[in-house]
Interface confidence: low
């Protein structure tokens, strides 16, 4: 019988008392085969973290800063359950640390040196750790002691709780730096008042502070937020303009063998029986013998943290950067205007080989980072381990939901002004063998299907979106008799046709021979009835253009397209017989790397783009013998996006809606994790 006990870690006598009460009350309402609580008492949160890592306890609830400590080696804990605040309909699990300024003050984030600053308090998250952590590398050296460096960075500050004797500049705007509400500029409201009164130029608070202090929209409109990309936004756009998104209070557990499902089962049942307004005798979110015991008193309930979400993703790139800067105190040598190398994310072995070749030819401008799946790459870009990659539209959607931005688009047509003219898109098509003359769009049920990969535009989102509208369920593996859709569950019938060996079978990378456009077409040639690809795939792989043995003698005339009206047409008539227009693949990156990725990629394509005529002796960025490594092989150039610089604008309303509908069928663990951070 599996042990269904969750050992909760308590950090004080009062917490231990509440834990025992929690244990006893849970026993009274949960059947004997259900989860139970045991209590472990430790002297501090750090001791609790160590105890969980050592398997002496299972769970504890932590503030964001401690979640970071818990994640660091050798602890390796992960967030499993989040407390939420507000209503069940609109649960708030995060708050946003923001920099508020007056509307007419005219400076940006990178111009804070010499300004006057208002802080909630020394060592506090939104008011000190996050802004100072993010500004850390701009502080004058020596950066230790930190208070002195901050004092020399701003021309005057109010940082309650600072030592006014040693660092008088930090108390210049609030003499004495009082560490309580006796100081009118203490805390969130105090820091905002410091700005409002004109004492300071910028206040570091949380997003709700402005709303709590200014009920009137006209008053709020006198203020703006400083964004990390050196722009400003209105105060109600805090989700798109903040210093960091910070989890409020989180239950952590071991990454391996951490009982995360059991912990959720326990807490989910606990909130049903003892949550807000549920029970008189025991209340989970109340602390009669203290404050915030085990859980925050202000919490309204729990939400399960998606399993794909590790601590880095949960805390977010900005928060992790800020805290790491403060803790480690390391900065690159004197920052210059020159861009650091762009770390390109390469999928599996083949892309890595091409990327390494690019890296060497780029002379230090490009570095390579490997991942096994596109989603792993997106996660690495999110957390700063990588910077950029080119993605199919379906993954541009996921990347966008995860906070990344498109920066350049692949263009596939030769034109005089290629780099300045992003194209409308390419066509998603359904290809069949001419010899299978009875096959139409209306009788695909029970046939064998070939897809570029799950989640990709032409190979999945468009055809499966259209199919979903017809069949109204997500069981595509029942609709087709078998197929190859790399990225499907390994035991699915949609992995049965795949050709990868061993662990590589059905993997969404080039180790699976039927992955991507060329792979899906090869799947049709060798095994399938229908392939969902792009309109250029057939001509690119027939007539001897692809020298691989399987493709060398193929003839375009042996294939036809399925039209949505139930007819069929020759391959060259794709403009009148396609499933939908698909957005071109695009390069994505983090917002903070956007300018550098744009600059370096434009340099790189001038060196190694389609103007290189001889790819046998020279490195060619857009060539890989029809394998579409790093970029599609038919890319002519990478084009500026102009104003289509968000994932919604880039993909277009229609496509975003189509993918949104298909989200009901999504198996993307990353999308689930990212929508948890930003619903």
């Amino acid at each position: 019988v599996p042990d269904k006990t969750v050992r909760w870690c308590a950090v004080s006598e009062h917490e231990a008392t509440k834990c025992q009460s929690f244990r006893d009350h849970m026993k009274s309402v949960i059947p004997s085969d259900g989860p139970s609580v045991a209590c472990v008492k430790k002297a501090s949160y750090l001791d609790c973290i160590r105890a969980i890592a050592a398997n002496e306890a299972d769970a504890v609830t932590l503030d964001a800063g401690l979640v970071y400590d818990a994640y660091l080696a050798p602890n390796n804990l992960k967030p499993v359950v989040a407390e939420f605040y507000g209503s069940k309909e609109d649960p708030q699990t995060f708050y946003y640390a923001v920099a508020v300024v007056k509307k007419d003050s005219g400076f940006q984030m990178n111009q804070l040196r010499g300004k006057k600053s208002c802080h909630t308090g020394l060592g506090r998250s939104a008011g000190w750790n996050i802004p100072i952590g993010l500004l850390y590398c701009d502080l004058p050296e020596p950066r230790k002691p930190l208070e002195k460096a901050v004092a020399n960075f701003f021309s005057g500050s109010c940082a309650p709780c600072a030592d006014g004797t040693d660092f008088p500049q930090l108390c210049q705007l609030c003499p004495g730096c009082g560490c309580s509400t006796l100081n009118q500029y203490f805390g969130y409201s105090g820091a905002f008042k410091c700005l409002k009164d004109g004492a300071g130029d910028v206040a570091f608070v949380k997003h709700s502070t402005i709303f709590e202090n200014l009920a009137n929209k006209a008053d709020r409109d006198q203020y703006e937020l400083l964004c990390l990309d050196n722009t400003r936004k209105p105060v109600d756009e805090y989700k798109d303009c903040h210093l960091a998104q910070v989890p409020s209070h989180t239950v952590v557990a071991r990454s391996m063998g951490g009982k995360e499902d059991l912990i959720w089962e326990l807490l989910n049942q606990a909130q049903e029986h003892f949550g807000k307004d549920k029970s008189k005798e025991f209340q989970l979110f109340s602390s009669p013998h203290g404050k915030d015991l085990l859980f925050k008193d202000s919490a309204h309930g729990f939400l399960k943290v998606p399993p794909r979400m590790d601590a880095k993703m949960y805390l977010g790139y900005e928060y992790v950067t800020a805290i790491r800067n403060l803790r480690e105190g390391t900065c690159p040598e004197a920052p210059t205007d020159e861009c650091k190398p762009v770390k390109w994310c390469a999928l599996s072995h083949h892309e890595r080989l091409k990327c390494d070749e690019w890296s060497v030819n780029s002379v230090g401008k490009i570095e390579c980072v490997s991942a096994e799946t596109t989603e792993d790459c997106i996660a690495k870009i999110m957390n700063g381990e990588a910077d950029a990659m080119s993605l199919d539209g379906g993954f541009v959607y996921i990347a966008g939901k995860c906070g990344l931005v498109p920066v350049l688009a692949e263009n596939y047509n030769k034109s005089d002004n290629c780099e300045d003219t992003p194209e409308a898109g390419y066509f998603a098509i359904a290809v069949v063998k001419k010899s299978a003359s009875d096959l139409t769009w209306d009788n695909l049920k029970g046939k064998k299907s070939c897809h570029t990969a799950v989640g990709r535009t032409a190979g999945w989102n468009i055809p499966m979106g259209l199919l979903y509208n017809k069949i109204n369920h997500c069981r595509f593996d029942e609709f087709f008799s078998e197929g190859c859709a790399p990225g499907s569950k390994k035991d699915s019938s949609l992995c049965k046709l795949c050709m990868g060996s061993g662990l590589n079978l059905c993997e969404p990378n080039n180790k699976e021979g039927y992955y991507g456009y060329t792979g899906a077409f090869r799947c049709l040639v060798e095994k399938g009835d229908v392939a969902f690809v792009k309109h250029q795939t057939v001509p690119q792989n027939t007539g001897g253009k692809n020298p691989d043995p399987w493709a060398k003698n193929l003839n375009e005339k042996d294939y036809e397209l399925l039209c949505l009206d139930g007819t069929r047409k020759p391959v060259e008539e794709y403009a009148n017989c396609h499933l939908a227009r698909a957005p071109n693949h695009a390069v994505v990156t983090r917002k903070d790397k956007e300018a550098c990725v744009h600059k370096i990629l434009r340099q790189q394509q001038h060196l190694f783009g389609s103007n290189v005529t001889d790819c046998s002796g020279n490195f060619c960025l857009f060539r890989s013998e029809t394998k579409d490594l790093l970029f599609r092989d038919d890319t002519v150039c990478l084009a500026k996006l102009h104003d289509r610089n968000t994932y919604e604008k880039y993909l277009g309303e229609e496509y975003v809606k189509a993918v949104g509908n298909l989200r009901k069928c999504s198996t993307s663990s990353l999308l689930e994790a990212c929508t948890f951070r930003r619903p």
Epitope: D356, V363, G609, V612
Partner: antibody, heavy 119, light 112 residues
Framework: VQLQESGPDLVKPSQSLSLTCTVT?????????WHWIRQFPENKLEWLGY???????NYSPSLKSRFSITRDTSKNQFFLQLNSVTTEDTATYYC?????????????WGQGTTVTVSS | IELTQSPSSLAVSVGEKVTMTCKSS????????????LAWYQQKPGQSPKLLIY???TRESGVPDRFTGSGSGTDFTLTISSVKAEDLSVYYC?????????FGSGTKLEIK
């Protein structure tokens, strides 16, 4: 592979300087990057820029605005044009080829042509 | 990237061992391929420079084995194990780690 620079010995300030590099023994469109480098009278070497076999060019940031490299593939030549010259541009100008791997390490050089900027 | 060569000049007798250094303002070691993006050139009086060493330690074909390049990161050395009269030259280091490629100011080798 041989490279040979040619051009005027003397140029007046504010005029343009045009130099030619003629390559024999290898087609400049077949591969590699083809560079211009100059050496000042006090022997300091400065990289100016290159034209890639693809036709792509890249220039030293300090000279970018008044500097261009072009080519004539039919004659297997590439050219340097430096506008608005000053006495500071007095130097020996070399054309060179890099070895591609390693990139930008010049394995073939011309013998150089000395240019004096003086009124 | 700035390259500082030392000494600026030195005079040695034929047969002696010579060492000259090149210091970079930042590391030239590229982590991906573990190569140092540094070359050494020899320029004899009245001639154009000639590539001696690339990747910091790889001799160009035809270069005598008395020339050896070593070092990694920011500190590099060119050693001539037994100087010959024909080695009278200025020796330059050059980085090709980042744009623009830059050269050191040179070490002039004179024969006593």
């Amino acid at each position: 592979v041989q490279l040979q620079e040619s051009g005027p010995d003397l140029v007046k300030p504010s005029q343009s300087l045009s130099l030619t590099c003629t390559v024999t023994g290898y087609s400049i469109t077949s591969g590699y990057s083809w560079h211009w480098i100059r050496q000042f009278p006090e022997n300091k070497l400065e990289w100016l820029g290159y034209i890639h076999s693809s036709g792509a060019t890249n220039y030293s940031p300090s000279l970018k605005s008044r500097f261009s490299i072009t080519r004539d593939t039919s004659k297997n030549q590439f050219f340097l044009q430096l506008n608005s010259v000053t006495t500071e541009d007095t130097a020996t100008y070399y054309c060179a080829r890099d070895g591609y791997s390693p990139p930008y390490a010049m394995d073939y050089w011309g013998q150089g042509t000395t240019v004096t900027v003086s009124s | 990237i700035e390259l500082t060569q030392s000494p600026s000049s030195l005079a040695v007798s034929v047969g002696e061992k010579v060492t000259m250094t090149c210091k970079s303002s930042q590391s030239l070691l590229y982590s991906t391929n573990q190569k140092n993006y540094l070359a050494w050139y020899q320029q004899k009086p009245g001639q154009s420079p000639k590539l001696l060493i690339y990747w910091a330690s790889t001799r160009e074909s035809g270069v005598p084995d008395r020339f050896t390049g070593s070092g990694s990161g920011t500190d590099f050395t060119l050693t001539i194990s037994s100087v010959k009269a024909e080695d009278l030259s200025v020796y330059y280091c050059q980085q090709y780690y980042s744009y623009p490629p830059t050269f050191g100011s040179g070490t002039k080798l004179e024969i006593k």
